[in-house]
C-alpha cells in the first residue's frame, strides 16, 4: 500500500538486481518541503525489510550515511535468493503517538547469472510434425531469464523462438513451428540455446543433428489383417505408414501370453504375411516404423489390433473313460466320459461330439451326437464292445478315439498291488502302486480314477481320471481335489481285453471330525449287543475316517471306559460287542478317527443287557 512516492524517493546502488552474496546501498530522500511540519531536524527516516509481505527487520542500525532531516543511506547484506521489499518510512519523533508515514519503497532481486543450457534434444514427430527442442537449464536463477532457441540449416536458413523462466513458469522446451522435409535427409542442422538475465548471459554448445537423427515417424495406423482362404494360421497384416518408412517392426502375441513374437520387415510397404498363427486364438498385433535401416529412431508402437484367428478342424485325440453297471442279468449301462480338448487342439468352438458304441462283430452299432462330455446307453451284457468319440467344430472333426469296453475290475490277476495315497499339500494327493504280480497279459496303461466319497457322487458327478504309461507307478492327482474331503481312488491296470483294479481312500488335508457317529439303536441277540449308528454327515467328516470307536462304561462309574475300535467301512453301520454284564446299566457312545485325530463323542445311549432268560 505504498502511495506512489509523494513524500520522497528510494534508490538502490549498484542496481535493484544483484548477485547472491553482494551488498546494496538503499538511499531514501525526502522531496523538498516534505517531512515533519515544524522541526525538519526531527525528521527520522527508517527502513523496513519485508519478505513475502511479512516485516522481518528494521534496518535502523544499518545507516551508513545521514543528512539529518533530508536523506539516509542504509547498507543491506546477506540478502536471500529471490525478491525482498524495502519500505522507507518517516518518523516524526516529536509526535510519539502518530505511526511512521510511508515515503517510498523498492524491490531488490537477488539471483545468479544463467548457466549454459545443456543436453539439447530435438525431435520432429512424423514427416509433417514440427521441430521441438528441450534442454536442461541448469541451476535456478531466481530471476526472469529469457531463452532463445536458434536453428540454422542449409543455405544460411535460420529460425528462432523465445520463452522465459520466472518464479511462475519454467522454460526448457520450445516448438520452432518449422517442419523439416525428407529431402533434407542428408543436411546438417545446428541448434543452440542462449540464456539471458539481468546478471549475465550464457550460450549452449552448438548441437548438430540430421533429419534422420530427430524425425520419429508417426506410429502406423489403420491396421487390419486378412486371413487367406479363412485360414486360421496364415494371415496378411496390412497398415498405413508415412511415405519415407523403410523398416517396420511387427510384434504379436496371443492375448493371454506374456512374450511377444517379433518380426523385422524391410520395405514392407504396409503389408506382411504371417504364417505361424494359432487357429481360433485372440491375438494382439502392433507395428512400429523407422525411416532408415541403420540410423534414426523407431516410432511409438501403433494402437493394438485385436482379433481372433479363424477356426480350423480339431486335432489331437480325446481322452475317454467309462463306467459299467449291470442293470440285470442280460443288460448293462455304459457311461462314457471324455475330457474337453485344450484350445490348441480344439482350434475352434466345439459344436458337438460324435459318439459310437459298436459290438466288435459288427452286429450292433449305436451312434449319436451330443454337446456334453458324457453319454450313457444301455446295451446287452453279451459281446465285446468298443466305443469311439470325435469332436467337431465348424471346420471339421477330429480323428475318432477308440476304447475297448472291458470289465474294469474283472481280473484279479491284473489288480495293482500296495496302492497308497499320501497327501502332498492342500490340493494334491500322491498315489503310488506296484504292478500286478501275475498278470497273464501285458499292462497297456494304468488309469487312476477318483471321486469324492459323498452321497450320490456316483450318479451326480462324473469321475476324474488320469492316464498313466505302463512303466510309471505313481500319479499326482490334483484336479478337483479339495482339502478335508475323502476321495475313493481306484488304480486300474488295463490290458488289451481285460482290466483289474485296486481301491483306496485318500485326502489332501484332514482334521479331526466335527462330531461322532449317532447311535440309533442297541439290540440284544444271543448274549451280544448290536450297536447301530448313522454315519457322520459328509461335511463334518473333514477327511477320510480310518476307524470308529465304541466306548462303554457302567453308569455312574468313574472308571475309564472300555472301547472297541472298528475299521471304517462305508457299507457298515452296526457292530456287535459281547463283554457287557447282564442287568448292569451301561452308557455307550461313539467317536470317529481321521489321520488328524479323534472326533468329540457322539450321542450317549444307556442300555441294560438282560442276559439269558431264566
Amino acid at each position: 500500500n505504498i502511495d506512489v512516492c509523494k513524500l520522497g524517493t528510494v534508490t538502490v546502488q549498484p542496481a535493484p538486481v544483484i548477485p547472491l552474496g553482494s551488498a546494496a546501498n538503499i538511499s531514501c530522500s525526502l522531496n523538498p518541503k516534505q517531512g515533519c511540519s515544524h522541526y525538519p531536524s526531527s525528521n527520522e527516516l527508517i527502513l523496513l525489510k519485508f519478505v513475502n509481505d511479512v516485516l522481518v527487520e528494521n534496518l535502523h542500525g544499518k545507516k551508513v550515511h545521514d543528512h539529518t532531516g533530508h536523506s539516509s543511506t542504509f547498507q543491506v547484506t546477506n540478502l536471500s535468493l529471490g525478491m525482498t521489499l524495502f519500505v522507507c518510512k518517516l518518523n516524526c519523533s516529536n509526535s510519539q503517538k502518530k505511526p511512521p508515514v510511508p515515503v517510498c519503497g523498492v524491490e531488490i532481486s537477488v539471483g545468479v547469472a544463467p548457466e549454459p543450457p545443456q543436453n539439447i534434444s530435438c525431435v520432429q514427430e512424423g514427416e509433417n510434425g514440427t521441430v521441438a527442442c528441450s534442454w536442461n537449464s541448469g541451476k535456478v536463477t531466481y530471476l526472469k531469464t529469457n531463452y532463445t532457441l536458434q536453428l540454422s540449416g542449409p543455405n544460411n536458413l535460420t529460425c528462432q523462438k523465445q520463452c522465459f523462466s520466472d518464479n511462475r513458469q519454467n522454460c526448457n522446451r520450445l516448438d520452432l513451428g518449422i517442419n523439416l522435409s525428407p529431402d533434407l535427409a542428408e543436411s546438417r542442422f545446428i541448434v543452440r540455446v542462449t540464456a539471458i538475465n539481468d546478471l549475465g548471459n550464457s550460450s549452449s554448445l552448438p548441437h548438430t543433428f540430421t533429419f534422420l537423427d530427430i524425425v520419429i515417424p508417426l506410429p502406423p495406423w489403420d491396421i487390419r489383417i486378412n486371413f487367406l482362404n479363412a485360414s486360421g494360421s496364415r494371415g496378411t497384416l496390412q497398415w498405413e505408414d508415412e511415405g519415407q518408412v523403410v523398416l517396420n517392426q511387427l510384434r504379436y502375441q496371443p492375448l493371454n501370453s506374456t512374450s511377444w513374437n517379433m518380426v523385422n520387415a524391410t520395405n514392407a510397404k504396409g503389408k506382411y504375411d504371417l504364417r505361424d498363427l494359432r487357429p481360433f486364438t485372440e491375438y494382439e498385433f502392433q507395428i512400429s516404423s523407422k525411416l532408415h535401416l541403420s540410423g534414426g529412431s523407431w516410432s511409438n508402437w501403433s494402437e493394438s489390433l485385436r482379433t481372433r484367428t479363424p477356426e480350423e478342424e480339431p486335432v489331437g485325440i480325446l481322452d475317454i473313460w467309462y463306467m459299467k453297471q449291470d442293470i440285470d442279468y442280460d443288460r448293462q449301462q455304459i457311461s462314457l466320459f471324455w475330457k474337453s480338448l485344450n484350445p490348441s487342439e480344439a482350434r475352434g468352438k466345439i459344436l458337438h461330439y460324435q459318439v459310437t458304441l459298436q459290438e466288435v462283430t459288427k452286429k450292433t452299432t449305436l451312434q449319436n451326437t451330443t454337446r456334453h462330455t458324457s453319454w450313457t446307453r444301455v446295451i446287452p451284457r453279451t459281446g465285446a464292445w468298443t466305443a469311439s468319440v470325435s469332436a467337431a467344430n465348424s471346420k471339421g472333426a477330429s480323428a475318432p478315439t477308440h476304447i475297448n469296453i472291458v470289465d474294469l475290475c474283472g481280473t484279479g490277476l491284473l489288480a495293482p498291488h500296495q496302492v497308497s495315497a499320501k497327501s502332498e499339500n492342500m490340493d494334491n494327493i500322491l498315489v503310488t502302486w506296484q504292478p500286478p504280480k501275475k498278470a497273464d497279459s501285458a499292462v497297456r496303461e494304468y488309469i487312476v480314477e477318483w471321486r469324492a466319497l459323498q452321497p450320490g457322487s456316483i450318479t451326480k458327478f462324473p469321475p476324474h481320471w488320469l492316464r498313466i504309461p505302463p512303466d510309471n507307478m505313481s500319479a499326482l492327482i490334483s484336479e478337483n481335489i479339495k482339502p478335508y474331503i475323502c476321495y475313493e481312488i481306484r488304480v486300474h491296470a488295463l490290458s488289451e481285453s481285460q482290466g483289474g483294479c485296486s481301491s483306496i481312500r485318500g485326502d489332501s488335508k484332514h482334521k479331526a471330525p466335527v462330531s461322532g457317529p449317532h447311535i440309533t439303536a442297541i439290540t440284544e441277540k444271543k448274549e451280544r449287543l448290536f450297536i447301530s449308528w448313522t454315519h457322520i454327515p459328509f461335511p463334518e467328516q473333514r477327511g477320510c475316517i480310518l476307524h470308529y470307536r465304541i466306548y462303554w462304561k457302567e453308569r455312574d462309574s468313574t472308571a475309564q471306559p472300555e472301547l472297541c475300535e472298528i475299521q471304517y467301512r462305508r457299507s457298515q453301520n452296526s457292530h456287535p460287542i459281547s463283554s457287557l454284564q447282564p442287568r448292569v446299566t451301561y452308557v455307550l457312545w461313539m467317536t470317529a478317527v481321521t489321520a488328524a485325530g479323534e472326533s468329540p463323542q457322539g450321542n450317549e445311549r444307556e442300555f441294560c443287557p438282560q442276559g439269558k432268560a431264566n
Epitope: 514440427t130 543455405n155 513451428g177 522435409s181 543436411s187
Partner: nanobody
C-alpha cells in the same frame, strides 16, 4: 484470416526501377520468414529475396544481388522490394509469401515451404 496484397507492378523500360509493396492483414511480422517470388511465363516460380524478421537475416537470389533490396515496415505491416537496373529477364508475375513453415533443401527459395501467398502483381520490363 491472413491476407497478403501486392502492389506497385507495372511496365518499365530496361534500366528502370520499381518498388513493390506487400500489405499484410491478420498477420504480424515478428519472427517469420517473408519472401518475394516471381514466375515468368512457362517457367517455375523462383525465389527472389527473403527476410527473416526474427533475426534480421536477409537473403537474395544471385541474379538480383546488388540490384534488388528487400525491407519491411513493421509499423505498417508491409514488406517491400526495391528493384533497380531492371532487365527484360526480370519480367514476370511477382508474389509475396509469408510464414516459412516447411524447410526443403532449396531453403527460403522453395515456394512449397510458405504458408501464405498473395495474388501477385505483374512486372514487365520492355523497351
Amino acid at each position: 484470416q491472413v491476407q497478403l496484397q501486392e502492389s506497385g507492378g507495372g511496365v518499365v523500360q530496361p534500366g528502370g526501377s520499381l518498388r513493390l509493396s506487400c500489405a499484410a492483414s491478420g498477420y504480424t511480422f515478428s519472427n517469420h520468414h517473408m519472401g518475394w517470388f516471381r514466375q515468368a511465363p512457362g517457367k517455375e516460380r523462383e525465389g527472389v529475396a527473403a527476410i527473416y524478421t526474427g533475426a534480421g537475416n536477409i537473403y537474395y537470389a544471385d541474379s538480383v544481388k546488388d540490384r534488388f533490396t528487400i525491407s519491411k515496415d513493421t509499423a505498417k505491416n508491409t514488406l517491400y522490394l526495391q528493384m533497380n537496373s531492371l532487365t527484360p529477364e526480370d519480367t514476370g508475375m511477382y508474389y509475396c509469401a509469408a510464414d516459412l513453415t516447411r524447410w526443403y533443401s532449396g531453403g527460403w527459395r522453395d515456394p512449397r515451404g510458405y504458408k501464405y501467398w498473395g495474388q501477385g502483381t505483374q512486372v514487365t520490363v520492355s523497351s
